[in-house]
């Protein structure tokens, strides 16, 4: 789960071990130099592409060993209470709309994965974050416009869904409804945040599956 310090560290890919080794080598050679992440990644990726299967073997062995470690630790890992119990989600409820950044990510994820095969989900996300930060306001606009449109649609759909789901609501007093409106909005905000976290988790899971295919 998120933030559980006892949860085993995720397994590392062969490429991740290679990058880690590159970083350590670079630190030894240039202890005081600050690393330009995108330049460094580019160089690592280029080196990885030219490496022979024999050279990659060492890192693949490290990845296998780490996978075994992860699986071993996961067998004995007990998640904190309540984590396995997800609150009921109506599959018919309108799906929360993606943010502008989320739309941007789905557009540029193939680029990152293509250029840096084997990059961990965290590093892919980090790179996408960097890319988003380097995208000028003018180029962010189409994603923001699309996200706003989808949000608008979602708000209409969710209102219709809630109205449909609560036929008694109309019979109850207007005053009582007004009082509870603020509380309800706060709850909805919390729900939205949870939804967003869950969607991110789902996307991470999907990515892990994608990585397995490659």
């Amino acid at each position: 789960g998120k933030g559980d310090p006892k949860k085993p560290r995720g397994k590392m890919s062969s490429y991740a071990f290679f990058v880690q080794t590159c970083r350590e080598e670079h630190k030894k050679k240039h202890p005081d130099a600050s690393v330009n992440f995108s330049e460094f990644s580019k160089k690592c990726s280029e080196r990885w592409k030219t490496m022979s299967a024999k050279e990659k073997g060492k890192f693949e062995d490290m990845a296998k060993a780490d996978k075994a470690r992860y699986e071993r630790e996961m067998k004995t890992y007990i998640p904190p209470k309540g984590e396995t119990k997800k609150k009921f989600k109506d599959p018919n409820a309108p799906k929360r709309p993606p943010s502008a950044f989320f739309l941007f990510c789905s557009e540029y994820r193939p680029k990152i994965k293509g250029e840096h095969p084997g990059l961990s989900i965290g590093d892919v996300a980090k790179k996408l974050g960097e890319m988003w930060n380097n995208t000028a306001a003018d180029d962010k606009q189409p994603y923001e416009k699309k996200a706003a449109k989808l949000k608008e649609k979602y708000e209409k759909d969710i209102a219709a869904y809630r109205a449909k789901g609560k036929p008694d609501a109309a019979k109850k007093g207007v005053v009582k409804a007004e009082k509870s409106k603020k509380k309800k909005e706060e709850e909805e905000d919390e729900e939205d945040e949870e939804d967003e976290e869950e969607e991110e988790d789902e996307e991470d899971e999907e990515e892990e599956e994608d990585d397995d295919d490659e």
């Epitope: 995108s38 193939p110 990152i112 994965k113 250029e115 380097n134 000028a136 003018d138 189409p142």
Partner: antibody, heavy 120, light 113 residues
Framework: EVQLLESGGGLVQPGGSLRLSCAAS????????MVWVRQAPGKGLEWVSR????????GYADSVKGRFTISRDNSKNTLYLQMNSLRAEDTAVYYC?????????????WGQGTMVTVSS | DIQMTQSPDSLAVSLGERATINCKSS????????????LAWYQQKPGQPPKLLIY???TRESGVPDRFSGSGSGTDFTLTISSLQAEDVAVYYC?????????FGQGTKVEIK
Amino acid sequence: EVQLLESGGGLVQPGGSLRLSCAASGFTFSGYMMVWVRQAPGKGLEWVSRISPSGGQTGYADSVKGRFTISRDNSKNTLYLQMNSLRAEDTAVYYCAREEGGSYGAFDIWGQGTMVTVSS
Amino acid sequence: DIQMTQSPDSLAVSLGERATINCKSSQSVLYSSNNKNYLAWYQQKPGQPPKLLIYWASTRESGVPDRFSGSGSGTDFTLTISSLQAEDVAVYYCQQYYSTPRTFGQGTKVEIK
């Protein structure tokens, strides 16, 4: 090797149409913004059009708006420029280029160009 | 649209001497949220496509000799060739990628004196 190769240029009469293609290789084509830039004989560079990685977003220079259509086929790693209602002032070498979108937005890879001549 | 204006239009410099090209944008291409200038420089030799030299106004593209350097911020930029070589004879263009449409300067022709 990262490469872009344009084709489809030629001589066409005013009012005619032409479809340019740009075949990409050596990189993840589906992850890049792609652009067309043209250069009239003896003149400077003029940005013509761009398309987002998925093909969902496009942009055009005012001089070609409504006449040119940019598109892409990610399964074929190919970029296209459909040029209709061609005018004499569209005569130029047409380059396709890769825009390093999201990383820095400059055009880091260029094709060799294809010549389009509009003349009667 | 952002207009890009280069000066001079042409420049003749002796081999080994410094060549300086200026580029001015009609509005700032500095994005305040990341403090980066969305400006690139290209080199175009006769009969060839342009080649990216500099991006972010001052970052050299990999493989570009270090005699090429870019500087400036906001609306005023400079491309400097510290010691002109015979192979540097070309037309140089600045370009903004801050907004769409992307726009180029008219070009500066660099020749040997």
